[in-house]
């Protein structure tokens, strides 16, 4: 039966046994900034195109040992997401992987500066049609990555982005501060805001929506068919990358602020639990959780 | 995310150093009055100190940056200090990154074009 | 263009091993594994498994788990397959295709086990 | 005996429609959306005519289309042509492998 996740983002009338738009995303070119990728799992066989785009610091630690399953992990369930053939958004997208994080999961603002670089300089080299640009990734607060995602977005690409998962403001992470970037906090099966351990999703005005996060099953880096289900504001940007590039594929015209807008107006309003948010920070948090749109397009989105 | 808001750097550290009138010998010198200034991550542990994004002025063309990317290394050498020029930027923003000393930072901030340094810092998979 | 170029027939007496090549070419290898599937004069298809030129993980069909051995050479961009202690049921074209979805195959290697 | 059941054989006259349909289990056909169909002529390699239960890929005549309902998956021709006469084979992911059917030989009246 259809996970969780794939079902609270489907509209209504398309919650058959199944969940399945074949050709969703097919004009949109998807770029993940991630770990490295198990690029030929069965999930994702032949949407992923490896980049040779790699900017990562070493791994922590004498000891570390780099298990490629485990270096893979990260990237490879986030691309499944997006574009798997069976537990996939928009299953018609391709994308393209670069590697700015390490085994550890650990990168920096400069490599991920020079990432959002060479897709700028890739888009004037080669232009395509609509790009989205999946960062699941945070830091602290930074000058020099939000002005790049800036200057990204005011060229066309639509970033989509984790909230993070500090239970914090997500003001003070980059670049989910960055205003020009869709930004996504995380909740669960229950439309509860998702705790990770002693912390959670980010919340606050930072954050443009939210998306499931909690218990999503994707593509698995420990087998080419294997999956595994994990939890984090990456995955839930995972999801809006995915609705963004189905919509984009309907209406590859649509500006960023029109994306957005429609975004919003077809989340669904008001079912998270906002107890779960500080109180000074409820009324500053949108009670919005990521869906398609419904049949209004279903020719375009469902084909 | 959520535009239409003002940006708010938050805790976020800002350091402003004032540009001296005394400029190193060098042939293009900044506009009076204005100001580079550092900023680095709030959160310690995530800072990565001796890595530092050099951002030139919106306008800097490709040649210029490495123009000032070299001139820091020189000016820096007969400090007595080495560098090391990592990556110069273009294409979203001007500037370069360099791998030096935090003792060279009040030196970077006066070199031309300079609009602001940013130390490098961390980030993570979520 | 995509393509994979198998190695030539064989004939082997039971018991044998036989190991047939597969070279594939006009894609990004790394996006696909290569499946091997093959077929006895006038049946089906069945599907032997699979390995991933990305790290050289396999997939093996139970049936064939611990006769068959599959490897690649990245330098070659070659697969290889190789069967061991040959039976007479073993008998059929052997063809690699391209990943899980099997969207391009090769022309297929004949091999005839007899004594 | 193969794990996915279609017809051993359709037939059908030039400018007729048929269909060729492939029942497996909710641990294959019901549980993936990768069932793909592939038609072999005498001495051929297969060719890959349905991914992914209903797409084409380039080059296929849109005369081919594919479909699922539950546990079956189908293919249909139509307006047959005497080229289409081959065998045609479905195959479906599983948990941790892939299983064809037997096959329906095709034949053009």
């Known amino acids: 039966s259809i996970p969780w996740n794939l079902e609270r983002i489907t509209p209504p009338r398309y919650r058959a046994d199944e969940y399945q738009p074949p050709d969703g995303g097919s004009l949109v070119e998807v770029y993940l900034l991630d770990t490295s990728i198990q690029s030929d799992h069965r999930e994702i066989e032949g949407r992923v195109m490896v980049t040779d785009f790699e900017n990562v610091p070493e791994e922590d630690g004498t000891r570390f040992h780099r298990q490629a399953s485990k270096c893979d992990s990260h990237g490879t369930h986030l691309a499944g997401v997006v574009s798997g053939r069976d537990a996939g958004v928009a299953k018609g997208a391709s994308m393209r992987s670069l590697r700015v994080l390490n085994c550890q999961g650990k990168g920096t603002v400069s490599g991920t500066l020079i990432g959002l670089e060479f897709i700028r300089k890739s888009q004037l080299v080669q232009p395509v049609g609509p790009l989205v640009v999946l960062l699941p990734l945070a830091g602290g607060y930074s000058r020099v990555l939000n002005a790049a995602c800036q200057r990204l977005a005011r060229a066309g690409v639509v970033l989509v982005t984790a909230a993070g998962n500090f239970r914090d403001d997500a003001c003070l992470y980059s670049p989910a501060s960055a205003p020009e970037v869709i930004t996504v906090g995380a909740t669960n099966a229950q439309d509860q805001p998702v705790t990770l351990g002693t912390l959670g999703t980010n919340f606050g005005r930072c954050v443009d929506l939210f998306a499931p996060g909690e218990d999503i099953i994707g593509a698995s880096s420990d087998c080419s068919t294997c999956f595994v289900s994990q939890s984090g504001t990456s995955q839930a940007a995972a999801h809006v990358a995915g609705i963004a590039a189905m919509m984009l594929s309907a209406e590859p015209e649509l500006t960023l602020a029109e994306l957005r807008q429609r975004l919003i107006h077809f989340s669904a309003k008001d079912v998270i639990n906002e107890a779960w948010f500080p109180e000074d920070q409820r009324v500053l948090t949108p009670n919005l959780v990521a869906a398609l749109p419904p049949s209004t397009h279903e020719n375009l989105y469902f084909q | 995310g959520a535009m239409g808001q003002e940006d708010e750097d938050g805790d976020y550290e800002e350091l402003v150093l004032a540009l001296r009138s005394e400029e190193d010998g060098l042939a293009e010198a900044p506009e009076h009055g204005t100001t580079a200034t550092f900023h680095r991550c709030a959160k310690d542990p995530w800072r990565l100190p001796g890595t530092y994004v050099v951002v030139l002025k919106e306008e800097t063309h490709l040649s210029q940056s490495e123009r000032t990317a070299r001139r820091l290394q020189a000016q820096a050498a007969r400090r007595g200090y080495l560098t090391k020029i990592l990556h110069v930027f273009h294409g979203l923003l001007p500037g370069f990154l360099v791998k030096m000393s935090g003792d060279l930072l009040e030196l970077a901030l006066k070199l031309p074009h300079v609009d602001y340094i940013e130390e490098d810092s961390s980030v993570f998979a979520q | 263009q995509v393509q994979l170029v198998q190695s030539g027939a064989e004939v082997k007496k039971p018991g044998a091993s036989v190991k047939v090549s597969c070279k594939a070419s006009g894609y990004t290898l790394t996006s696909y594994g290569i499946s091997w599937v093959r077929q006895a004069p006038g049946q089906g298809l069945e599907w032997m498994g699979w390995?991933?030129?990305?790290?050289?993980?396999?997939n093996y069909a139970q049936k064939v788990q611990g006769r068959v051995t599959m490897t690649t050479d990245t330098s070659t961009s070659t697969v290889y397959m190789e069967l061991r202690s040959l039976r007479s049921d073993d008998t059929a074209v052997y063809y690699c295709a391209r990943g899980y979805g099997m969207d391009v195959w090769g022309q297929g290697t004949t091999v005839t086990v007899s004594s | 005996q193969s794990a996915l059941t279609q017809p051993a054989s359709v037939s059908g006259s030039p400018g007729q429609s048929i269909t060729i349909s492939c029942t497996g289990t909710?641990?294959?056909?019901?549980?993936?959306?990768?069932v793909s169909w592939y038609q072999q002529h005498p001495g051929k390699p297969p060719k890959l005519m349905i991914y992914?239960?209903?797409n084409r890929p380039s080059g296929v005549s849109i005369r081919f289309s594919g479909s699922k309902s539950g546990n079956t998956a189908s293919l249909t021709i139509s307006g047959l042509q005497a080229e289409d006469e081959a065998d045609y084979f479905c195959s479906s992911y599983t948990s941790t492998s892939m299983v064809f059917g037997g096959g329906t030989k095709l034949t053009v009246l």
């Open positions: 992914e239960v209903s």
């Open positions: 909710s641990s294959d056909v019901g549980g993936y959306n990768s």
């Open positions: 390995i991933s030129f990305y790290n050289g993980n396999t």
